[in-house]
Amino acid sequence: TQNKALPENVKYGIVLDAGSSHTSLYIYKWPAEKENDTGVVHQVEECRVKGPGISKFVQKVNEIGIYLTDCMERAREVIPRSQHQETPVYLGATAGMRLLRMESEELADRVLDVVERSLSNYPFDFQGARIITGQEEGAYGWITINYLLGKFSQKTRWFSIVPYETNNQETFGALDLGGASTQVTFVPQNQTIESPDNALQFRLYGKDYNVYTHSFLCYGKDQALWQKLAKDIQVASNEILRDPCFHPGYKKVVNVSDLYKTPCTKRFEMTLPFQQFEIQGIGNYQQCHQSILELFNTSYCPYSQCAFNGIFLPPLQGDFGAFSAFYFVMKFLNLTSEKVSQEKVTEMMKKFCAQPWEEIKTSYAGVKEKYLSEYCFSGTYILSLLLQGYHFTADSWEHIHFIGKIQGSDAGWTLGYMLNLTNMIPAEQPLSTPLSHSTYV
């Protein structure tokens, strides 16, 4: 008789990341009997929902169910039917919805209400949809990357199983860049965290962590651009804005109403003598960099040290994983290699931004123009944010690792969120049970 394989004793979890520009659904899988082990949960699927972020559905709220259908049906296919009822589903909304809530709590609630009703119709164990705080977004991103890097494991290994892993158990800091906010999270070296709002205390696998985190709302790459435009149009002499952050020859007409519809530009709002203006790219990295720096108020700091806008930031410590848009933008620009120095990155950005728009379109014919036009600004913004905003230097640049995935799982807040909500990160180190780990014979 043939040996029949025993049914896999596995569990699944689903997290939807409702970001400012789009929604992604992640499916995670882990062995049921190793729930409390570190590093056993891994991503088996990512499904990007077609369409914009949920905050854009205020005028079409009843379509949210349809919007989520394809990815939820994909989850139904990937996860065995016998597991559906015990598979938790979580949706976390980030800065796009934080901004909508600032404009109208009622509209934000209505969007979330429809999301909840839609997700409740599936055979999974729906656990709720909510707007997560910036502090949570930072913390869960930090948990995700350190969990995947094996930093919470108490077993020291003589070999490395994951990239960037050194034998020490020092955690990595987390740098997350979205469309509407950016987060910085790390364990400072023996430094008191001077502002309570930025302090987190964790006990994970028997070890205490004092973590610094801050989320800068309106400083994601998309909202930062709108801020910059709103700032620059104030001093424009007419409806032409010559912009160094776009390639020479690039032109784009912008509606003033679009510029002022986000709360992020409120501080720059003024009555303009025109309804539209035209951006004309001049492609100058240095001038673009200077313009971006004007978004960071560094003149005021009530602490021993600040990032910008009066926000406390301790001295940087250790290695950092930079993910989400930090990674996507730098990957496009071919600047994610560990060997590329900060000076080289700056040099490459200068060359890239100076390339004529027609030339860029030819070189990257397969890329949608709406995305292609953004990389000069986004790359320059990343450099400005990391160097002037967070005080990385040419020397400490080598401690930044641009990370897309670790061991096949996306770097981001979703895995940490699920690990926390399913109580899969114990406070104490679990006792090893016989044969729960592979043994050498």
Epitope: V49, K50, P52, E63, T69, D70, K221, W226, K370
Partner: nanobody, 124 residues
Framework: QVQLVESGGGLVQPGGSLRLSCAAS????????MGWYRQAPGKERELVAA???????NLADSTKGRFTISRDNTKNTVYLQMNSLKPEDTAVYYC??????????????????WGQGTQVTVSS
């Protein structure tokens, strides 16, 4: 931009059938879903049926079991097959398509396109 052209409306007796068509042209790669809405005199516009880019369908409770929505990708056309029609199905039927706005920039906006509408009258 996306252009939507509807056809197939008309007068039909109760219990009869009609098939509406909606042909899409333009930058359709960004479309996430297409569907049909209807508006009866003095009433609000309501969703009848929708089909996603992945082929999943969604029908209003009032039309389940009677109406079906389908699409032909080669013709970029969506169909609404309406059977067992009732007088209360009388309305102007509008084709709708929505998705990512390709002209939006630094943050994705929702694009929302509508056809001109086609009259469906169910009467004996």
């Amino acid at each position: 931009q996306v252009q939507l052209v509807e056809s197939g409306g008309g007068l039909v007796q109760p219990g009869g059938s009609l098939r509406l068509s909606c042909a899409a042209s333009g930058s359709i790669s960004s479309i996430a879903a297409m569907g049909w809405y209807r508006q009866a005199p003095g009433k609000e516009r309501e969703l009848v049926a929708a089909i996603t880019s992945g082929g999943n369908t969604n029908l209003a409770d009032s039309t389940k079991g009677r109406f079906t929505i389908s699409r032909d990708n080669t013709k970029n056309t969506v169909y609404l097959q309406m059977n067992s029609l009732k007088p209360e199905d009388t309305a102007v039927y509008y084709c709708n398509a929505w998705g990512e706005d390709d002209s939006s920039w630094f943050g994705t906006d929702l694009c929302d396109y509508w056809g001109q509408g086609t009259q469906v009258t169910v009467s004996s």
